[in-house]
């Protein structure tokens, strides 16, 4: 029963994690304009892996895709690759783990086959989670580096009179979604691997031994104690991630309703 619960829980946690990785990959808010210690602008910039967006204080939002492949920074390409690999591995892992679930009967599938599939999906979830965490962390590192570089020369004098203010970017919501989702996928994968150990049948087959007790004749046959109850057949797997949409007030820079600018 515990094995089934562990496997089922591992599957659900991984499912939520992979949904989160997909959401993070699609979100536009990987980096958002830093508003601290900056002149207050009526325009808010944010960027994702696939496009950059500008929202004016009027509410008008315009997004532009990165229509070049060769012109993009290598680090951004690497992050894209890591996230896609994470999603693909996670999706395959989910597919494999569905057939590996102990509560699902498929023909006369051996327990050893289910154990192998559980282990495979567990490893896939672990690698998927690591890919997502790595991707998000690489992007975060890139942001930190750029942030301090642009802080160092934030005001670039032009002829002494005119100043251009560089837009600095800080961590966007997608990074936190990605870290949490990657962590959940990783935890789910570990749970699947733990469940695999419980699923694997014992290698040593003991001969059945009869023990005669006074008054009762009970034969104890060790080796094949299986839980007959299915786990969570009516469990609802709810996707609880946010696809990246934000209202003006949620993302907007202004901390209070009354601002002096």
């Amino acid at each position: 029963m515990a094995v089934t619960a562990c496997q089922g829980l591992g599957f659900v946690v991984s499912l939520i994690g992979i949904a989160g990785i997909i959401a993070a990959t699609c979100m536009d808010q990987w980096s958002t304009q830093d508003l601290y210690n900056n002149p207050v602008t009526a325009v808010f910039n944010y960027q994702g892996l696939w496009r950059s967006c500008v929202r004016e204080s009027s509410g008008f939002t315009e997004c532009r895709g990165y229509f070049t492949l060769l012109g993009l920074p290598a680090m951004l390409q690497a992050v894209r690759a890591l996230m896609i690999v994470g999603i693909v591995l996670g999706a395959i892992g989910l597919l494999v783990s569905i057939f590996a679930l102990k509560c699902i009967r498929i023909g006369s599938m051996e327990d050893s086959a289910k154990a192998n599939m559980t282990l495979t999906s567990g490893i896939m979830f672990i690698v998927s989670g690591l890919c997502a965490i790595a991707g998000v962390s690489v992007f975060a590192n890139m942001l930190v580096t750029n942030f301090w570089m642009s802080t160092a020369n934030m005001y670039t004098g032009m002829g002494g009179m005119v100043q251009t203010v560089q837009t600095r970017y800080t961590f966007g919501a997608a990074l936190f979604v990605g870290w949490v989702a990657g962590g959940l996928t990783l935890i789910g994968g570990v749970m699947m691997c733990i469940a695999c150990r419980g699923l694997a049948p014992e290698e040593t087959n003991y001969k059945a031994v009869s023990y005669h007790a006074s008054g009762h004749s009970v034969a104890y046959k060790p080796g094949g104690f299986k839980a007959s109850t299915g786990f969570g057949s009516n469990t609802k797997n709810k996707k609880i991630y946010d696809g990246g949409a934000r209202t003006e007030d949620e993302v907007q820079s202004y901390p209070s309703k009354h601002d002096y600018v």
């Epitope: 304009q33 002149p39 207050v40 602008t41 009526a42 325009v43 910039n45 960027q47 950059s52 967006c53 500008v54 004016e56 204080s57 009027s58 509410g59 008008f60 315009e62 532009r64 005119v162 100043q163 251009t164 203010v165 837009t167 003006e248 007030d249 202004y254 309703k257 009354h258 601002d259 600018v261």
Partner: antibody, heavy 119, light 113 residues
Framework: QVQLVQSGAEVKKPGSSVKVSCKAS????????IEWLRQRPGQGLEWMGE????????KYNVKFKDRVTITADESTSTAYMELSSLRSEDTAVYYC????????????WGQGTLVTVSS | DIVMTQSPSSLTVSLGEKATISCKSS????????????LTWYQQKPGQPPKRLIY???TRESGVPDRFSGSGSGTDFTLTISSLQAEDLAVYYC?????????FGQGTKVEIK
């Protein structure tokens, strides 16, 4: 069609306050900013502040800090601008305007309200 | 605050001639995210409220005659009236709508020779 109708001209004494109204019609008000600006005689335009109808979010020009209060009554589609501690240099035409959906600038304007501060 | 400097303060042009008004900002109004400059041009006729002519430095407001055009990026902007008409007699203002508080130029009065 979009219309912003402002209240009539006012004559005020120094130290008193004035409250100018701006009634909007002809569009869905929620989600639009209403701006308040002023123009002193023979001078340029000065931005005072703005209110986002539907959310109550307000921004003020720090120059008018503590003297200007911008409010709105959603039920009557009316925005208000109150300027206190009036001085003779506050004599101006006060405008309300709507911030357009593109460009952060003001696409429709009220007809203006002349406020004269005189002892 | 951003300082907007317009030149000249007044301009006298013959009907049918070209009128050019310049506007400079103390900081760049160019947003790197969309490569748009947040500068607006307004026309104010005597006794009337201002009317938006051009936003994003070069986008003409619908209904504005095509003799009005805006150009420039960053800190230097120009409003051009290609062929001045009698009804163009007005004061023209440029506005920074990138940084709060929004600021205006002192205005350029266009008169007919």
């Amino acid at each position: 069609q979009v219309q912003l109708v402002q209240s009539g001209a006012e004559v005020k004494k120094p130290g008193s306050s004035v409250k100018v109204s701006c009634k909007a019609s002809g569009y869905t008000l929620t989600g639009y900013w209403i701006e308040w600006l002023r123009q002193r005689p023979g001078q340029g335009l000065e931005w005072m502040g703005e209110i986002l109808l539907g959310s109550g979010s307000i921004k003020y020009n720090v120059k008018f800090k503590d003297r200007v209060t911008i409010t709105a009554d959603e039920s009557t589609s009316t925005a208000y601008m109150e300027l206190s501690s009036l001085r003779s240099e506050d004599t101006a035409v006060y405008y309300c305007a709507r911030k357009g959906l593109r460009g952060n600038s003001f696409d429709y304007w009220g007809q203006g309200t002349l406020v004269t501060v005189s002892s | 605050d951003i300082v907007m400097t317009q030149s000249p303060s007044s301009l006298t042009v013959s009907l049918g001639e070209k009128a050019t008004i310049s506007c400079k900002s103390s900081q760049s109004l160019l947003n790197a995210g969309n490569q748009k400059s947040y500068l607006t041009w307004y026309q104010q006729k005597p006794g009337q409220p201002p009317k938006r002519l051009i936003y994003w430095a070069s986008t003409r407001e619908s209904g504005v005659p095509d003799r009005f055009s805006g150009s420039g990026s960053g800190t230097d902007f120009t409003l051009t009236i290609s062929s001045l008409q009698a009804e163009d007699l007005a004061v023209y203002y440029c506005q920074n709508d990138y940084y709060y508080p929004f600021t205006f130029g002192q205005g350029t009065k266009v008169e007919i020779k």
